[in-house]
């Protein structure tokens, strides 16, 4: 016997109890693909969430977080509040970075300044709560006579033009 | 956590009516689609019915005398019997999912059900 759901189309559901007849999705629900029993009840962005797409027959609703959240997890399937640059969200809420690390984003985690000493360079410019340390060339790159691989550039003395 | 409480069962004379109610708590219903079924003593479970959306789908068996309504703002959904059978005689489920119907469907929360004796 030939299964007559498979004809059903999406946005459709094939209803066993009336010989396998295709009835359309009621509102709010959808079907992707053809030859379903059932329809799926579409998602509602309520509360923390904002709709991005409406759901309709055969799509489900797709949602954001409104202002002040950002999405977190598989199609933004929760909101986390916001925090500043140079704070972290904690259990109480959003709290500054502390001492020696930093955050450049509105979410995720504080993290430490890099360690430029680990690589055998100097600290050019201080790091922040908001950004991280910038490194430059290795104390014994500064010290006069060392090698480089790219020689700078001789100075212009007063009164000389460069040989 | 979510919690279904069925009510409005007991014993009824042939011809007679009933309205079952489900109530949730610990979520409303405005996510889910809201089901009914029966299980007769020695028989399987049997679906009775689905609630989505103002749309209602309804088990082959019941020849139009059962209705599933929803009162929203009571978070509550009613299954009227009218002209009652004896072969109606079972334990009446309330239940919920993200599939309509839920003919085929495994539903996500199911409550404990309420008695319906149709006996003269």
């Known amino acids: 016997l030939q299964d007559l759901c498979s004809n059903c189309p999406a946005g459709t559901f094939c209803d066993n109890n009336r010989s396998q007849i295709c009835s359309p999705c009621p509102p709010n629900s959808f079907s992707s693909a053809g030859g379903q029993r059932t329809c799926d009840i579409c998602r509602q962005c309520k509360g923390v969430f904002k709709t991005r797409k409406e759901c309709s027959s055969t799509s489900n609703a797709e949602c954001d977080c409104i202002s002040g959240y950002h999405c977190l997890g598989a199609e933004c399937s929760m909101c986390e509040q916001d925090c500043k640059q140079g704070q972290e969200l904690t259990k109480k809420g959003c709290k500054d970075c502390c001492f020696g690390t930093f955050n450049d984003q509105k979410r995720g985690i504080c993290r430490p300044w890099t360690n430029c000493s680990l690589d055998g360079k100097s600290v050019l410019v201080n790091g922040t709560k908001e950004r991280d340390v910038v490194c430059g060339p290795s104390p014994a790159d500064l010290s006069p006579g060392a090698s480089s691989a790219t020689p700078p550039a001789p100075a212009r003395e007063p009164g000389h033009s460069p040989q | 956590e979510v919690q279904l409480v069925e009510s409005g069962g007991g014993l009824v004379q042939p011809g007679g009516s009933l309205r079952l109610s489900c109530a949730a708590s610990?979520?409303?219903?405005?996510?889910?689609?809201v089901g009914w079924f029966r299980q007769a003593p020695g028989k399987e479970r049997e679906y009775v019915g689905t609630y989505w959306s103002g749309y209602a789908h309804y088990g082959d068996f019941e020849n139009n005398r059962f209705t599933i309504s929803r009162d929203n703002a009571k978070n509550t959904v009613y299954l009227q019997m009218n002209n009652l059978r004896p072969e109606d005689t079972a334990v009446y489920y309330c239940a919920i999912s993200l599939k309509y119907p839920m003919a085929t469907v495994t539903p996500d929360y199911q409550g404990q059900g309420t008695q319906v004796t149709v006996s003269s």
């Open positions: 610990g979520r409303t219903f405005d996510n889910y689609a």
